[in-house]
């Protein structure tokens, strides 16, 4: 079955800057990726970015730069200050819509013991929802 992995990293140089990387471990064709924070998209989470394979990238503050890394993984840099700034225990979720598997979503946050600039390896996170 497909899996989604999520990796969250705090940048050593800017403590309010996070990088989120997500990937899809499946054989289907990805049709949309949605990155959210504060919980799963559509379940209390707030959308940070939508990446469409053909039409481009739509992102909302404090997302600064979302990009496709490969045809099955994306990265998102967040830069915040004040109310819109992420904190160390913020949960980030990635939802991959693919054909024919459907939608698969997983969430992750900064590892509790991680120093700035470090992160956990990008291991598959628990699948929260498969539509």
């Amino acid at each position: 079955t497909p899996e989604v992995w999520v990796q969250v990293r705090m940048e050593a140089t800017e403590l309010s800057s996070f990088t989120i990387r997500c990937g899809f471990l499946g054989s289907g064709s990805i049709s949309l990726v949605t990155v959210s924070w504060g919980g799963p998209n559509g379940a209390g989470g707030t959308t940070l970015a939508v990446l469409h394979p053909e039409r481009g990238i739509r992102q909302w503050a404090p997302a600064r730069q979302a990009r496709w890394e490969t045809q099955s993984s994306i990265s998102l840099i967040l830069e915040g200050s004040g109310a819109s700034s992420p904190c160390a225990n913020t949960t980030f979720c990635c939802k991959f819509a693919s054909f024919p598997e459907g939608s698969w979503e997983a969430c992750g946050s900064l590892p509790p013991s991680s120093d700035p600039g470090l992160s956990a390896p990008p291991t598959p996170a628990p699948i929260l929802r498969a539509d």
Epitope: H52, P53, E54, R55, G56, I57, R58, Q59, W60, A63, Q65, A66, R67, W68, E69, T70, Q71
Partner: antibody, heavy 120, light 113 residues
Amino acid sequence: EVQLQQSGPELVKPGTSVKISCKASGYTFTDYYMNWVRQSHGKSLEWIGEINPKNGDTNYNQNFKGKATLTVDKSSNTAYMELRSLTSEDSAVFYCAREGVSSYYAMDYWGQGTSVTVSS
Amino acid sequence: DIVMTQSPSSLAMSVGQKVTMSCKSSQSLLNSFNQKNFLAWYQQKPGQSPKLLVYFASTRESGVPDRFIGSGSGTDFTLTITSVQAEDLADYFCQQHHSTPPTFGGGTKLEIN
């Protein structure tokens, strides 16, 4: 035929607000985000923000947060932009532009523009 | 934000001449998923609103004459008018449509001798 018809020119006083409209026709209004773009004194173009007519979700250029508010009226296929606390620096031509079929931000149809002049 | 820089700011050409104008972006506009460059060109004639000419760096919008040719990849792009006509008198703007916020170059003003 896709058309975006904007409201007429505005002459307003400093400190006041103005609300300009963009009536869409020739396509399904709720299928495409609407963008707003500013052009100051015939110079370059600056993206203000976008709105999803389906649900009213907005996305603003940080430079215009607090200055512009985007809304839609689905019943009349009309998008609106309100500009507040106007100063002479806000004098410009404002365009509505539909998101592209092929790409989110390649804007394929534009309104004719609304000139806003802020003067006492 | 991605910064777009156009050159020259203006140029004057005679009817029938070949015109080239440049646009550079501060970061790559190549989408690594589909290998497309998210760069658009707009034409704005005096007193009119902008008109989309080219998107994905080289795809002409429907109805645009084939004398308008977009090219380039990554951060360097060019709009060429192979044989300029009197009606091409306009400002030309490049714009990245890669990601939010979309940003425009300062424009190139094309004058006809």
